[in-house]
């Protein structure tokens, strides 16, 4: 998920030269940028993070906040350093007037500048009649290990930590750093104040209506009693996290963020640091019923952004509103009138609905899977998480029409045995930002650091777009779509797996100029093709060119359009196979699908022909999914027969290993 | 390590009061609750009620209800049971326990009600 | 409350294997994955030797096994030795406390 998402607010301050000698331009020229939450009622003026350039040092950053509070004094301002991040990303924490923004714009090191802004618990209601427990038959949910090697850190407000559900699972840390409570007669009751974070500890790791029961869990305050926090405090949580883990390592740690707010670059910059630390982070995709993009932490990709479900499998909703949903959402879950833990009394249970009880369960799930296997890292738990969901079980009528192809239709399931899924070649799909509708616009799909991008596709729902192709940024590859004329933007699809040892290029061919089409194909010894792209430059590709076929006995090239550039991702890993399946519908259709068997992973997904009636390819898990234009605007000509083309891929390395631990 | 310390024995005249204490040293309190156990002699447990060391909230078996008053003093991280209208059948052993799990026990405190 | 159901007493020889049984009802045993058993020798307090049904606190030797099918509980103690000889209690979350067993006298002929 990018930084061109949404209504989120960028006001770049151009540096003006009234005031001579106000500060040192920053370095090289560049312009430091200024962030405010879109959301304004959301929005905390007056205090402000200070971002400043990734390698700056502790020293640095001091010295950067003594030099605006001196440099603020002299133009007769007060300002407050608040606090000085360091271990997650270095900057600083300044209450001052929003006068002082550019001058603070101007200092050395600073990259950007963000104001605060609130974020808020994502469950409702909080008081809710007193419930009796769950009853656990024996013979019903016993997990065989209930995430007892992993610490699960939940970020919320207070809890009741020696609720009998949850005594002994909770350590109280003494991090606390929350916002004053609205009004000026609000009544702090100690069970509406611990009433979020204590019904949560227990669905992650309550003894008997908890997910993960061997889990231990550590809490820090960072919302108040209305359920209200800030992103600076929640950045201050993170930060203490990270310090906590470098003073004591201990086993694989999980951080549940049971909160949501606008989105926030510096927000997402922190999950994206902690993450990259080795920590999995799980949140609520947010009540809003609305983009999960739009909102932070929901919106930063390395964090695992948990919807919510009812027991029907369909979207809850919550009053007028209900979760968010979209390509930020990488899963859903329970939450709707889940049972917990209720701070009214030591044995109380109450019902909460919300996508911070989705988050708590997948946090739970997380948790017993790290314990069982220790050693996975953020992409491989990300990618069995949603391996073993339910697949195609949530309504997506219940989303707006253009969310729908963009959000998965998954819910969370712990897997049928902790152990043993090694083999599998897992892969998942990631969705761009939308492009926008210039000419020249683009997206950009990314894989996680330590997944391979085995293909790329695109779809626009105008099918006015230039196709796709993957190339190389920053040493990984990348998968770019690109819009047409007249296009009303394009997104591009990446297909992203675990494949250990791989060794990936892409293999390219120009427009053809004989009519026979374009064709590329992995010549390397050992590589085989895991996905084809095409990228044209013209505006409508050739609408009544035939068809082209791909020729018997050639499965390991790509084939495409003659004006089109041709992309063959090729692959060396040991034991890797791969096989091209298609299914062509002579008739026009609006959808064309093909799907792997038992055992083989979708790699690549494309259509033949790519021309301009076609709206694009995507992978749907196994299934290859293409889409035309409206039936009734292409007619019955020859143009309207679309194939679709799946790449199977298998790893023959991945099942032995795994037959040998067994 | 983990510890209960509970006071020492008393005996007491029917009618009467007895306030006992257990202090609590070596885990973080506020995780756990206090529970209190007595047990009559040749007899078996007892579970009288539980005390909340984070907030002072209580849960009393309904047996002793409107006789038992558990307090805490987190200052010195010592919880109270005391017991009102003393009986010759309240006469037992009183244990403290650490929380709901009772994985920690005191040594316990004779109380004898005799007139 | 009424007290959950454990036999009087049991007896076996050292090195064999005895099990104690706690019944109790769907709203205590059979609602909770929260069944303790302690042990107690005489003028001692108790001793927790299992919790939630099957776990074994630290130091607590793997002789002692603990299950649960419907409202039953169990207590497994295997290879029998002397120094297990002792009284044992179950017990178990209710609604909104706590209900012991009635206790079991274990002798090792």
């Known amino acids: 998920q990018e930084d061109e998402d949404g209504d989120y607010e960028e006001l770049v301050l151009a540096l003006r030269s009234e005031e001579d000698g106000l500060a040192e331009a920053p370095e090289h020229g560049t312009t430091a940028t200024f962030h405010r939450c879109a959301k304004d009622p959301w929005r905390l003026p007056g205090t402000y993070v200070v971002v400043l350039k990734e390698e700056t040092h502790l020293s640095q950053s001091e010295r950067t906040a003594r030099r605006l509070q001196a440099q603020a004094a002299r133009r007769g301002y007060l300002t407050k350093i608040l606090h000085v991040f360091h271990g997650l990303l270095p900057g600083f924490l300044v209450k001052m007037s929003g006068d002082l923004l550019e001058l603070a714009l101007k200092l050395p090191h600073v990259d950007y500048i963000e104001e605060d802004s609130s974020v808020f618990a994502q469950s409702i209601p909080w008081n809710l009649e007193r419930i009796t427990p769950p009853r656990y038959r024996a013979d019903e949910y016993q997990p065989p290990d209930g995430g007892s090697l992993v610490e699960v850190y939940l970020l919320d407000t207070s809890i009741q930590s020696d609720h009998r559900e949850i005594e002994g699972r909770v350590m109280v840390t003494d991090f606390e750093n929350v916002p004053e409570e609205d009004g000026t007669r609000f009544h702090r009751q100690a069970s509406k104040c611990d009433s979020h974070g204590t019904h949560l500890a227990g669905v992650v790791s309550g003894r008997d209506a908890g997910v993960a029961k061997g889990a231990s869990m550590r809490s820090l305050r960072v919302l108040n009693c209305q359920g209200k926090g800030t992103v600076s405090g929640t950045l201050i949580g993170l930060e203490f996290i990270r310090k906590s883990q470098l003073v004591q390592p201990v086993g694989p740690l999980v951080v549940l963020l049971p909160l949501a707010g606008g989105y926030s670059r510096v927000l997402n910059a922190a999950c994206q640091r902690l993450a990259r630390a080795g920590v999995v982070l799980v949140t609520a995709a947010g009540n809003f019923r609305d983009d999960a993009c739009l909102y932070s932490p929901a919106s930063a990709p390395e964090v695992i952004t948990v919807g919510a479900t009812n027991a029907q499998d369909q979207p809850v909703t919550l009053g007028t509103l209900g979760t968010n949903f979209g390509r930020c959402v990488d899963l859903f879950a329970p939450g709707e009138d889940i049972i917990g833990a209720s701070s009214d009394c030591s044995t109380c249970f109450v019902s909460q609905s919300g996508t911070s009880q989705a988050a708590a369960h997948v946090a739970g799930i997380a948790a017993m899977m790290l314990s069982a296997e220790p050693e996975l890292t953020l992409a491989e738990l990300r990618q069995r998480l949603i391996h073993f969901s339910a697949k195609d079980v949530i309504n997506e009528a219940w989303f707006p029409e253009d969310q729908r192809v963009l959000t998965p239709n998954l819910v969370a399931a712990l897997p049928p045995s902790t152990h043993g899924a090694g083999w599998q070649l897992f892969c998942r799909t990631v969705w761009s930002a939308h492009s926008g509708p210039t000419r020249m616009a683009t997206a950009v799909a990314r894989c996680a650091p330590d997944e391979e991008l085995l293909s790329c596709s695109s779809f626009s729902r105008s099918g006015k777009r230039r196709g796709e192709r993957m190339e190389a940024q920053g040493g990984k590859l990348v998968c770019r779509a690109h819009n047409a004329f007249g296009g009303e933007g394009v997104y591009a699809i990446a297909r992203c797996c675990l494949l250990p040892q791989a060794n990936c290029s892409v293999h390219t061919a120009p427009p053809a100029e004989a009519s026979m089409g374009t064709r590329v194909h992995c010549h390397q010894q050992g590589h085989v093709l895991t996905g084809c792209s095409s990228h044209w430059e013209v505006e409508d590709l050739g609408t009544h060119k035939p068809p082209v076929l791909r020729p018997r006995g050639q499965p390991n090239q790509c084939v495409g359009h003659r004006e089109a550039s041709i992309h063959a991702s090729c692959c060396h890993a040991p034991g890797l196979e791969c096989k091209v399946k298609e299914h062509g519908i002579p008739a026009p259709q609006e959808q064309v699908t093909v799907a792997c068997e038992e055992g083989w992973t979708l790699t690549g997904c494309s259509a033949l022909p790519g021309t301009s009636h076609v709206l694009g390819a995507y992978a749907v898990d196994n299934t290859c999914v293409v889409r035309s234009r409206d039936v009734s605007t292409t007619g019955s000509t020859s143009e309207g027969a679309v194939t679709a083309v799946a790449i199977c891929c298998r790893s023959r390395h991945l099942a032995q290993a795994s037959q040998e631990l067994q | 390590q983990v510890q209960l310390v509970q006071s020492g024995a008393e005996v007491k005249k029917p009618g009467a009061s007895v306030k006992v204490s257990c202090k609590a040293s070596?885990?973080?309190?506020?995780?756990?609750?206090i529970s209190w156990v007595r047990q009559a002699p040749g007899q078996g447990l007892e579970w009288m009620g539980w005390i909340s060391a984070y907030n002072g909230n209580t849960n009393y078996a309904q047996k002793v209800q409107g006789r038992v008053t558990m307090t805490t003093d987190t200052s010195t991280s010592t919880v109270y049971m005391e017991l009102r209208s003393l009986r010759s059948d309240d006469t037992a052993v009183y244990y403290c326990?650490?929380?709901?799990?009772?994985?920690?026990w005191g040594q316990g405190t004779t109380v004898t009600v005799s007139s | 409350q009424s007290a959950l159901t454990q036999p009087a007493s049991v007896s076996g020889s050292p090195g064999q294997s005895i099990t104690i049984s706690c019944t109790g009802t769907n709203s205590d045993v059979g609602g909770y994955n929260s069944v303790s058993w302690y042990q107690q020798h005489p003028g001692k307090p108790p001793k927790l030797m299992i919790y939630e049904v099957s776990n074994r606190p630290s130091g607590i030797s793997n002789r002692f096994s603990g299950s649960k099918s419907g409202n039953t509980a169990s207590l497994t103690i295997s290879g029998l030795q002397a120094e297990d000889e002792a009284d044992y209690f179950c017990s178990s979350y209710t609604s909104t406390s706590m209900v012991f067993g009635g206790g079991t006298k274990l002798t090792v002929l």
């Open positions: 070596g885990y973080a309190l506020t995780s756990y609750g």
């Open positions: 326990a650490r929380g709901y799990g009772m994985d920690v």
